[in-house]
């Protein structure tokens, strides 16, 4: 049974040109994490393994750090980097968590963040 | 340098049994998920079994589930298929792979043929 | 079982040429999709994970693209070498499923 909850950053805001910590956080479950990819809509943006530790898809690599922690930072951010991502914790035995973000990339300095909020 | 190795292949009656293994070294290999994938002859690839780098969770083929399990020996470098009741339709060319953040194959061994005849 | 449909199932090339081979899922892999390169009595050789990432050592003149369904493999300028099947494969899921292959045979 699966009784773990995944804890996100939520909606959240931030300025063209800036930078953003997409950040989840798996409670609730003594599970083990094994990994976790983010990922942007349709594409795979980097995976921190517990083994192997971090891989950044080589055409983000200019422009995703990892962490911190099991975190991504998204850099040099512009208005197409506007949308959804998801962070999704293998864990074991578990199973699969998975977490959303949405992301506004705004042209204006009046970028605030949002509430954090939880997915079961 | 990464090197995949396997033994164990031959042939075999129908019903019979056989156990594949797979000797790694160049890398970590308690770090890596490893997998089979076969290749039946003129015919293209697929995927057999599955197992995570602490052995802890394996996945299998509909085809393979119940008569192939897969294990592996950290301490010896060494991924294993242990495969019963084997039909002719199991004679292929076994391949074992080491997969990185179980999303692509990397490296692959050069095979072991197992044919299953009368 | 996600389905990987890969067509076209043969091509006939020269060398010099450009040539497109594409992969359908059954159903969204994200971008959860590679690319392998096998030659006669060899083991199949990563080119593409990911999607669109070149593995390291692979010639430039290969290159993926797509997300959600539909993949496609280019090889910009068709080399000698390059004669040989490919297949796609997804990891979106267990099962992984590969495509039938294409073969690549000289003109």
């Known amino acids: 049974m699966m009784t773990g909850t995944i804890e996100t950053t939520g909606n959240i805001s931030a300025e063209k040109g800036g930078s953003i910590i997409l950040q989840c956080h798996l409670s609730s479950t003594t599970a083990q994490v094994t990994q976790v990819n983010w990922e942007q809509q349709d594409q795979l943006l980097a995976i921190c393994n517990a083994d192997l530790g971090w891989h950044i898809s080589p055409s983000f690599k200019d422009r995703v750090a990892p962490g911190p922690g099991l975190g991504l930072t998204l850099q040099s951010l512009t208005v197409n980097d506007t949308g959804e991502y998801f962070c999704i914790y293998h864990t074991y035995p578990d199973g699969t968590y998975t977490g959303r973000i949405f992301l506004e990339v705004l042209e204006s300095s009046v970028a605030e963040h949002g509430a954090r909020f939880q997915i079961p | 340098e990464v090197q995949l190795l396997e033994s164990g292949g031959g042939l075999v009656q129908p019903g019979g049994s056989l156990r594949l293994s797979c000797a790694a070294s160049?890398?970590?290999?308690?770090?890596?998920?490893m997998h089979w994938v076969r290749q039946a002859p003129g015919k293209g690839l697929e995927w057999v079994s599955g197992i995570s780098s602490n052995g802890g969770s394996t996945s299998y083929a509909d085809s393979v589930k119940g008569r192939f399990t897969i294990s592996r020996d950290n301490s010896k470098n060494t991924l294993y298929l242990q495969m019963n009741s084997l039909r002719a339709e199991d004679t292929a060319v076994y391949y074992c792979?080491?997969?990185?953040?179980?999303?692509?194959?990397?490296?692959w061994g050069q095979g072991t043929l197992v044919t299953v005849s009368s | 079982d996600i389905q990987m449909t890969q067509s076209p199932s043969s091509l006939s090339a020269s060398v010099g040429d450009r040539v497109t081979i594409t992969c359908r899922a059954s159903?969204?892999?994200?971008?959860?999709l590679n690319w392998y390169q096998q030659k006669p009595g060899k083991a199949p050789k990563l080119l593409i994970y990911a999607a669109s990432s070149l593995q390291s050592g692979v010639p430039s003149r290969f290159s993926g693209s797509g997300s959600g369904t539909d993949f496609t493999l280019t090889i910009s300028s068709l080399q000698p070498e390059d004669f040989a099947t490919y297949y796609c494969?997804?990891?979106?899921?267990?099962?992984?499923?590969f495509g039938g292959g294409t073969k690549v045979e000289i003109k």
């Open positions: 159903q969204s892999i994200s971008s959860y």
């Open positions: 494969q997804q990891s979106y899921s267990t099962p992984l499923t």
């Open positions: 160049g890398f970590t290999f308690s770090s890596y998920a």
């Open positions: 792979a080491r997969v990185p953040y179980a999303v692509w194959i990397d490296y």
